[in-house]
Amino acid sequence: KIVLDPSGSMNIYLVLDGSDSIGASNFTGAKKCLVNLIEKVASYGVKPRYGLVTYATYPKIWVKVSEADSSNADWVTKQLNEINYEDHKLKSGTNTKKALQAVYSMMSWPDDVPPEGWNRTRHVIILMTDGLHNMGGDPITVIDEIRDLLYIGKDRKNPREDYLDVYVFGVGPLVNQVNINALASKKDNEQHVFKVKDMENLEDVFYQMIDESQSLSLCGMVWEHRKGTDYHKQPWQAKISVIRPSKGHESCMGAVVSEYFVLTAAHCFTVDDKEHSIKVSVGGEKRDLEIEVVLFHPNYNINGKKEAGIPEFYDYDVALIKLKNKLKYGQTIRPICLPCTEGTTRALRLPPTTTCQQQKEELLPAQDIKALFVSEEEKKLTRKEVYIKNGDKKGSCERDAQYAPGYDKVKDISEVVTPRFLCTGGVSPYADPNTCRGDSGGPLIVHKRSRFIQVGVISWGVVDVCKNQKRQKQVPAHARDFHINLFQVLPWLKEKLQDEDLGFL
């Protein structure tokens, strides 16, 4: 498999058949598949070097792994997008052997002077062809030469099979399955041959190809493949339940932010709630996690403005639940990214020198910002797309807080909508779905560069649009939701999470 280890070294060679028998639309489809693969790999913070070859009668090398930009995913994608099926029109035979020789030439080195770490570099060849080679001879001989070069299968004690993977995608109207199977790697419990119809569900294909065991602690990563559970798609999501004898129970959501902490809303708890009465579950697991302590933001005080006629005041409505035992990360349990951390810098593929302010400008620019939250409907977690009103609609969004029960007498809306809040909901630019009571404490998320970054904590809403936990279809335009802006509570997060190795900026 493609071992995505951020500290490892990898070369990926993309080889695309542009011969007559492929056809323009299949060529374009294959290109799109490779673009998606580059993006998927880049989303792991891994920077492999890419080689890019198209071929028909002759190969054309577009990107060499030795080029300075070959590890720049955006640049490689640009080169790939600029390739035309017409590029091989005049010499449109199929010489797969020559194409693989071009890959060999990129991999190779003069006698005795291999590049440093040659024996620690993994090589992945992704060949997209119909297998109908009609000139140059059998391409399998070049695969043997590559294995020889990389010292694979020579030493019984150390066969090094992990260091070469050859994936073959059958593209085109007619595919010679025998030829394709012959070229692909054969490894136990791994799939190295894919068909055209597989390419309709690329996430499923990538799931077969990628070994992410070295990067389970990466924040904001998800799997969207069809066999995945709700928690493959939202692995940070935590369900919180507070049992109060004689008073029933309160349901909230939260987000895993580290191996020991879940971030949620402070209003989910009262000062009287004992740790043993708080149930937290993650990853869709039935068992509850043991709680060590709940840490409230020191400035949170729901009764803080009662004297001023404000019955409930949600400023600084954030809390961290510290778990007794360390979470074991896996594909259904992993952290979400937090603002102003090194993990988020890497997730957004920003330079290491990026400041907190620059992250803020990237994630919360002064405009309508596409975001999402996760809600549970009929026992299923679903993503709801909303827009954070952070530009010219911000004022009107915040003013609608006056329609909230108990806030109608508030003279100045900034009394309840402090600078700590982000506002969503309403009908412009689109009709946003609203949060329900049980969504409180869950993350408000920005999805960028295939990663998920939490920017807010769901706090309160103007209208309860979820009678009996069913969302009403028709909701008034003033149905707004308010979320604690994490950029505004960073000093507290930084202090409480200082031992969690998140690398706050």
């Epitope: 060499k64 792994v65 030795s66 080029e67 030439s105 990129m106 991999m107 190779s108 080195w109 003069p110 006698d111 005795d112 002077v113 291999p114 590049p115 440093e116 040659w118």
Partner: antibody, heavy 118, light 112 residues
């Protein structure tokens, strides 16, 4: 600190043989190819050959085949070069140099001066 | 064998000014992998050679960034941006594309 310590100067008679050494320290001896380079007085550098200390496999510049023999002693992390049938043409400064992948000869010994004279 | 050619002496340079040393090869040193296997060494008087530049344009560890290497497949240049007294010596180019590895005759840097 990586060091290549070469044996002292040699004064030898024509037709005789000489064996010089290069003791490596500060790194894993078997991990890098050891090379030998000749520098005749006031002249350029000439690559003689290299040896792989891991398995003793040697490769020679055709010009020095039959003239030079490269060997290693892994137990003492020492490379040796023997030159035979010496003539005045072999009078030169001989360097050992460590080859580090494709970075080139990153470390050199201080050289062994061989003088062939009757 | 690949022949490396250098002029025996550089044009005399003044300390603090820049100097260029040239080298050419009888065959292109550009490998099919895209890397050019050309190296520069400096031998100061009475010392062993020292690696300056590897793979045509990469600065070796510990070498001041006053030194830089450039070139095409067969013609190469070593540039010293501000010559200092310690830069005096003989500069050798070498190729590692094909065995036997070969060195140029060396260029002596002359100070005015």
């Amino acid at each position: 600190e990586v060091q290549l310590q070469q044996s002292g100067p040699e004064l030898v008679k024509p037709g005789a043989s000489v064996k010089m050494s290069c003791k490596a320290s500060g790194y894993s001896f078997t991990d890098y190819l050891m090379n030998w380079v000749k520098q005749s007085h006031g002249k350029s550098l000439e690559w003689i050959g290299r040896i792989n200390p891991y398995n003793g496999d040697a490769f020679y510049n055709q010009r020095f085949k039959g003239k030079a023999t490269l060997t290693v002693d892994k137990s003492s992390s020492t490379a040796h070069m023997e030159l035979r049938s010496l003539t005045s043409e072999d009078s030169a400064l001989y360097y050992c140099a460590r080859l580090e992948n494709d970075y080139g000869f990153t470390y050199w010994g201080q050289g062994t001066l061989v003088t062939v004279s009757a | 064998d690949i022949v490396m050619t250098q002029a025996a002496f550089s044009n005399p340079v003044t300390l603090g000014t820049s100097a260029s040393i040239s080298c050419s090869s009888s065959k292109s040193l550009l490998h099919s992998n895209g890397i050019t296997y050309l190296y520069w060494y400096l031998q100061r008087p009475g010392q062993s050679p020292q690696l300056l530049i590897y793979r045509m344009s990469n600065l070796a560890s510990g070498v001041p960034d006053r030194f830089s290497g450039s070139g095409s497949g067969t013609d190469f240049t070593l540039r010293i941006s501000r010559v200092e007294a310690e830069d005096v010596g003989v500069y050798y180019c070498a190729q590692m594309l094909e065995r036997p590895w070969t060195f140029g005759g060396g260029t002596k840097l002359e100070i005015k």
